[in-house]
Interface confidence: medium
Protein backbone atom coordinates (compact mmCIF):
# COMPACT_ATOMS: atom_id res chain seq x y z
CA UNK A 1 0.00 0.00 0.00
CA UNK A 2 1.09 3.63 0.19
CA UNK A 3 2.96 4.18 3.57
CA UNK A 4 6.67 4.43 3.02
CA UNK A 5 8.40 7.61 2.56
CA UNK A 6 7.94 10.64 5.15
CA UNK A 7 7.31 14.23 3.57
CA UNK A 8 5.74 17.05 5.24
CA UNK A 9 3.71 17.28 1.84
CA UNK A 10 1.55 15.06 1.02
CA UNK A 11 1.15 15.94 -3.15
CA UNK A 12 5.23 15.23 -2.40
CA UNK A 13 4.91 12.08 -0.72
CA UNK A 14 2.62 10.83 -3.67
CA UNK A 15 5.17 12.21 -5.76
CA UNK A 16 8.25 10.62 -4.64
CA UNK A 17 5.82 7.16 -4.20
CA UNK A 18 4.87 7.64 -8.10
CA UNK A 19 8.34 7.85 -8.42
CA UNK A 20 9.45 4.30 -6.21
CA UNK A 21 6.70 2.92 -8.12
CA UNK A 22 8.00 4.26 -11.82
CA UNK A 23 11.55 2.73 -11.06
CA UNK A 24 10.54 -0.63 -9.41
CA UNK A 25 8.93 -1.37 -13.02
CA UNK A 26 11.66 0.00 -14.68
CA UNK A 27 14.31 -2.15 -13.15
CA UNK A 28 11.51 -4.93 -12.89
CA UNK A 29 11.48 -5.12 -16.85
CA UNK A 30 15.20 -4.68 -17.16
CA UNK A 31 15.97 -8.05 -15.04
CA UNK A 32 13.01 -9.97 -16.99
CA UNK A 33 14.78 -8.76 -20.24
CA UNK A 34 18.53 -9.88 -18.25
CA UNK A 35 16.85 -13.21 -17.43
CA UNK A 36 15.18 -13.68 -20.94
CA UNK A 37 18.65 -13.07 -23.09
CA UNK A 38 20.50 -15.79 -20.63
CA UNK B 1 -20.07 -1.20 -5.43
CA UNK B 2 -17.74 1.17 -3.69
CA UNK B 3 -19.47 2.70 -0.63
CA UNK B 4 -18.56 5.39 1.79
CA UNK B 5 -21.33 6.50 4.44
CA UNK B 6 -20.58 8.99 7.22
CA UNK B 7 -22.02 9.29 10.84
CA UNK B 8 -21.33 11.75 13.63
CA UNK B 9 -22.58 14.79 12.95
CA UNK B 10 -24.57 17.15 15.05
CA UNK B 11 -24.80 20.52 17.19
CA UNK B 12 -21.98 21.06 18.98
CA UNK B 13 -21.42 24.42 20.97
CA UNK B 14 -17.99 26.67 19.99
CA UNK B 15 -15.38 25.05 22.18
CA UNK B 16 -16.71 21.81 22.21
CA UNK B 17 -15.46 18.33 20.15
CA UNK B 18 -17.21 15.86 18.02
CA UNK B 19 -15.98 12.50 16.53
CA UNK B 20 -17.19 11.78 12.58
CA UNK B 21 -16.55 8.28 11.31
CA UNK B 22 -16.46 7.15 7.47
CA UNK B 23 -17.70 3.15 7.14
CA UNK B 24 -15.74 1.89 3.61
CA UNK B 25 -17.28 -0.73 1.77
CA UNK B 26 -16.83 -2.29 -1.60
CA UNK B 27 -12.58 -2.18 -2.17
CA UNK B 28 -9.47 -3.01 -0.61
CA UNK B 29 -9.57 -0.09 1.93
CA UNK B 30 -6.21 -0.41 3.43
CA UNK B 31 -4.60 0.12 0.09
CA UNK B 32 -6.28 3.59 -0.76
CA UNK B 33 -4.97 6.94 0.82
CA UNK B 34 -8.10 8.93 2.30
CA UNK B 35 -9.42 12.11 2.57
CA UNK B 36 -12.09 14.64 4.78
CA UNK B 37 -13.59 17.39 2.39
CA UNK B 38 -15.79 19.94 3.56
CA UNK B 39 -18.34 22.45 2.05
CA UNK B 40 -19.74 25.60 3.96
CA UNK B 41 -23.65 26.33 3.68
CA UNK B 42 -24.02 28.09 0.49
CA UNK B 43 -20.00 28.43 -0.22
CA UNK B 44 -17.40 25.71 -2.07
CA UNK B 45 -15.43 22.76 -1.32
CA UNK B 46 -11.96 22.78 1.33
CA UNK B 47 -9.79 19.78 2.26
CA UNK B 48 -9.63 19.45 5.80
CA UNK B 49 -7.41 16.13 6.38
CA UNK B 50 -5.97 13.63 4.16
CA UNK B 51 -4.36 9.95 5.43
CA UNK B 52 -2.11 7.55 4.25
CA UNK B 53 -2.90 3.86 3.53
CA UNK B 54 -1.63 2.10 6.61
CA UNK B 55 -2.71 4.97 8.58
CA UNK B 56 1.31 6.00 9.17
CA UNK B 57 0.99 9.44 7.83
CA UNK B 58 -1.63 12.53 7.92
CA UNK B 59 -1.74 16.17 6.58
CA UNK B 60 -3.69 18.93 7.21
CA UNK B 61 -4.07 22.53 6.20
CA UNK B 62 -3.51 25.08 8.40
CA UNK B 63 -7.05 26.07 9.23
CA UNK B 64 -7.66 23.19 11.57
CA UNK B 65 -4.21 21.79 11.97
CA UNK B 66 -3.57 20.70 16.11
CA UNK B 67 -7.41 20.76 16.29
CA UNK B 68 -8.46 18.17 13.80
CA UNK B 69 -7.15 14.65 13.54
CA UNK B 70 -7.50 11.97 11.16
CA UNK B 71 -6.91 8.37 12.11
CA UNK B 72 -8.51 4.92 10.52
CA UNK B 73 -9.11 1.56 11.37
CA UNK B 74 -8.82 -0.63 8.38
CA UNK B 75 -9.48 -4.02 10.45
CA UNK B 76 -12.88 -2.13 10.34
CA UNK B 77 -12.71 -0.53 7.67
CA UNK B 78 -13.35 2.97 9.16
CA UNK B 79 -12.12 6.31 8.92
CA UNK B 80 -12.41 9.21 11.65
CA UNK B 81 -11.99 12.60 12.06
CA UNK B 82 -12.30 13.75 15.70
CA UNK B 83 -12.62 17.63 15.69
CA UNK B 84 -11.80 19.76 18.92
CA UNK B 85 -11.82 23.66 19.58
CA UNK B 86 -14.60 23.95 17.29
CA UNK B 87 -15.45 27.15 15.85
CA UNK B 88 -18.69 28.79 14.39
CA UNK B 89 -16.32 28.47 10.74
CA UNK B 90 -15.94 24.46 11.13
CA UNK B 91 -20.04 24.79 10.09
CA UNK B 92 -20.22 22.50 7.24
CA UNK B 93 -20.98 19.48 5.58
CA UNK B 94 -18.17 16.86 5.87
CA UNK B 95 -17.23 14.45 3.20
CA UNK B 96 -15.03 11.64 2.90
CA UNK B 97 -13.32 10.87 0.45
CA UNK B 98 -11.62 7.80 -1.36
CA UNK B 99 -7.95 9.12 -3.05
CA UNK B 100 -7.86 7.34 -6.57
CA UNK B 101 -5.31 4.37 -6.96
CA UNK B 102 -3.18 6.64 -9.77
CA UNK B 103 -0.27 8.18 -9.45
CA UNK B 104 -2.10 11.51 -9.62
CA UNK B 105 -1.76 13.33 -6.03
CA UNK B 106 -5.15 14.70 -4.54
CA UNK B 107 -7.82 13.68 -6.79
CA UNK B 108 -10.52 11.83 -5.34
CA UNK B 109 -12.05 9.21 -7.23
CA UNK B 110 -15.14 8.46 -4.97
CA UNK B 111 -17.39 10.14 -2.42
CA UNK B 112 -19.93 9.87 0.74
CA UNK B 113 -23.28 12.14 0.54
CA UNK B 114 -21.93 13.79 4.00
CA UNK B 115 -22.97 14.47 7.18
CA UNK B 116 -23.86 17.88 8.82
CA UNK B 117 -21.56 19.49 11.64
CA UNK B 118 -23.22 22.97 13.24
CA UNK B 119 -21.11 24.96 15.71
CA UNK B 120 -23.58 27.52 17.58
CA UNK B 121 -24.23 28.55 21.07
CA UNK C 1 -1.56 29.05 -0.48
CA UNK C 2 -2.14 28.44 -4.21
CA UNK C 3 -5.49 30.30 -5.34
CA UNK C 4 -7.73 28.99 -8.06
CA UNK C 5 -9.54 31.65 -10.00
CA UNK C 6 -12.82 29.93 -11.98
CA UNK C 7 -14.24 31.80 -14.55
CA UNK C 8 -16.90 32.39 -15.68
CA UNK C 9 -19.05 32.01 -11.61
CA UNK C 10 -22.08 31.27 -13.90
CA UNK C 11 -22.83 30.24 -17.20
CA UNK C 12 -25.68 29.97 -19.39
CA UNK C 13 -25.75 27.75 -21.99
CA UNK C 14 -28.73 26.06 -24.77
CA UNK C 15 -28.73 22.36 -24.59
CA UNK C 16 -26.06 21.24 -27.03
CA UNK C 17 -24.22 23.89 -27.48
CA UNK C 18 -20.66 24.11 -25.70
CA UNK C 19 -19.64 25.07 -22.31
CA UNK C 20 -16.54 26.41 -21.41
CA UNK C 21 -15.14 26.91 -17.53
CA UNK C 22 -11.75 28.27 -17.13
CA UNK C 23 -9.18 27.32 -14.23
CA UNK C 24 -6.48 30.00 -13.24
CA UNK C 25 -4.05 28.77 -10.75
CA UNK C 26 -1.88 31.46 -9.23
CA UNK C 27 0.85 29.43 -9.32
CA UNK C 28 1.79 26.31 -11.54
CA UNK C 29 0.38 23.15 -10.42
CA UNK C 30 2.94 21.39 -13.11
CA UNK C 31 5.87 19.01 -11.89
CA UNK C 32 7.33 16.92 -13.57
CA UNK C 33 5.27 16.46 -16.44
CA UNK C 34 2.18 16.45 -14.84
CA UNK C 35 -0.14 18.52 -14.35
CA UNK C 36 -1.92 18.03 -11.20
CA UNK C 37 -5.17 19.57 -11.59
CA UNK C 38 -8.72 18.03 -11.18
CA UNK C 39 -11.96 18.78 -12.09
CA UNK C 40 -15.63 17.81 -10.17
CA UNK C 41 -19.05 18.06 -10.87
CA UNK C 42 -21.80 18.87 -7.98
CA UNK C 43 -25.37 19.00 -8.33
CA UNK C 44 -27.46 19.78 -5.60
CA UNK C 45 -27.77 17.97 -2.58
CA UNK C 46 -25.09 15.47 -4.09
CA UNK C 47 -21.58 15.26 -3.13
CA UNK C 48 -18.64 16.24 -5.69
CA UNK C 49 -17.99 13.88 -8.90
CA UNK C 50 -14.28 13.15 -9.99
CA UNK C 51 -14.51 14.04 -14.09
CA UNK C 52 -11.23 15.03 -14.71
CA UNK C 53 -7.62 13.95 -13.14
CA UNK C 54 -4.41 15.47 -14.21
CA UNK C 55 -5.74 18.10 -15.93
CA UNK C 56 -7.00 15.74 -19.36
CA UNK C 57 -7.85 12.58 -18.33
CA UNK C 58 -11.60 11.20 -18.03
CA UNK C 59 -12.57 9.16 -15.05
CA UNK C 60 -14.10 5.94 -16.07
CA UNK C 61 -17.80 5.67 -16.38
CA UNK C 62 -17.81 9.86 -17.55
CA UNK C 63 -19.63 10.69 -21.04
CA UNK C 64 -16.85 11.67 -23.52
CA UNK C 65 -18.49 15.28 -24.25
CA UNK C 66 -16.94 16.11 -21.26
CA UNK C 67 -12.77 17.01 -21.71
CA UNK C 68 -10.13 18.94 -19.79
CA UNK C 69 -6.73 20.87 -21.19
CA UNK C 70 -3.94 22.72 -20.07
CA UNK C 71 -1.06 22.96 -18.14
CA UNK C 72 0.85 25.56 -15.73
CA UNK C 73 -1.41 28.11 -14.49
CA UNK C 74 -4.25 28.06 -16.95
CA UNK C 75 -6.76 24.85 -17.43
CA UNK C 76 -10.11 24.55 -18.82
CA UNK C 77 -13.04 22.33 -18.76
CA UNK C 78 -15.32 22.01 -21.85
CA UNK C 79 -18.33 20.17 -22.63
CA UNK C 80 -18.99 19.97 -25.83
CA UNK C 81 -22.76 19.78 -26.15
CA UNK C 82 -24.72 20.40 -22.96
CA UNK C 83 -27.14 18.26 -21.90
CA UNK C 84 -30.20 18.79 -19.51
CA UNK C 85 -28.37 16.26 -16.55
CA UNK C 86 -25.28 18.48 -16.82
CA UNK C 87 -26.68 21.46 -14.71
CA UNK C 88 -24.49 21.38 -11.71
CA UNK C 89 -21.56 23.34 -10.03
CA UNK C 90 -18.28 22.77 -11.71
CA UNK C 91 -15.25 22.74 -8.77
CA UNK C 92 -11.16 22.99 -9.98
CA UNK C 93 -8.92 21.87 -7.35
CA UNK C 94 -4.89 21.47 -7.51
CA UNK C 95 -2.78 19.14 -5.89
CA UNK C 96 0.64 20.17 -6.81
CA UNK C 97 1.21 22.03 -3.11
CA UNK C 98 0.03 21.21 0.15
CA UNK C 99 -2.69 22.46 1.27
CA UNK C 100 -5.18 21.29 -1.76
CA UNK C 101 -6.99 24.33 -3.09
CA UNK C 102 -10.42 24.36 -4.43
CA UNK C 103 -11.60 27.17 -6.87
CA UNK C 104 -14.70 29.17 -6.08
CA UNK C 105 -17.00 27.20 -8.37
CA UNK C 106 -18.83 27.95 -11.60
CA UNK C 107 -22.70 27.31 -12.06
CA UNK C 108 -23.71 26.09 -15.41
CA UNK C 109 -27.53 26.08 -16.36
CA UNK C 110 -29.79 25.44 -19.58
CA UNK C 111 -30.90 28.99 -21.11
Known amino acids: HSDGIFTDSYSRYRKQMAVKKYLAAVLGKRYKQRVKNK | EVQLVESGGGLVQPGGSLRLSCAAS????????MSWVRQAPGKGLEWVAT????????WYPDSVKGRFTISRDNAKNSLYLQMNSLRAEDTAVYYCARLTGYDQAGAMDYWGQGTTVTVSS | DIVLTQSPDSLAVSLGERATINCKASQSVDYDGDSYMTWYQQKPGQPPKLLIY???HLDSGIPDRFSGSGSGTDFTLTISSLQAEDVAVYYCQQSNEDPWTFGGGTKVEIK
Open chain 3, 54 to 56: AAS
Open chain 2, 51 to 58: ITGGGSYT
Open chain 2, 26 to 33: GFAFNNYD
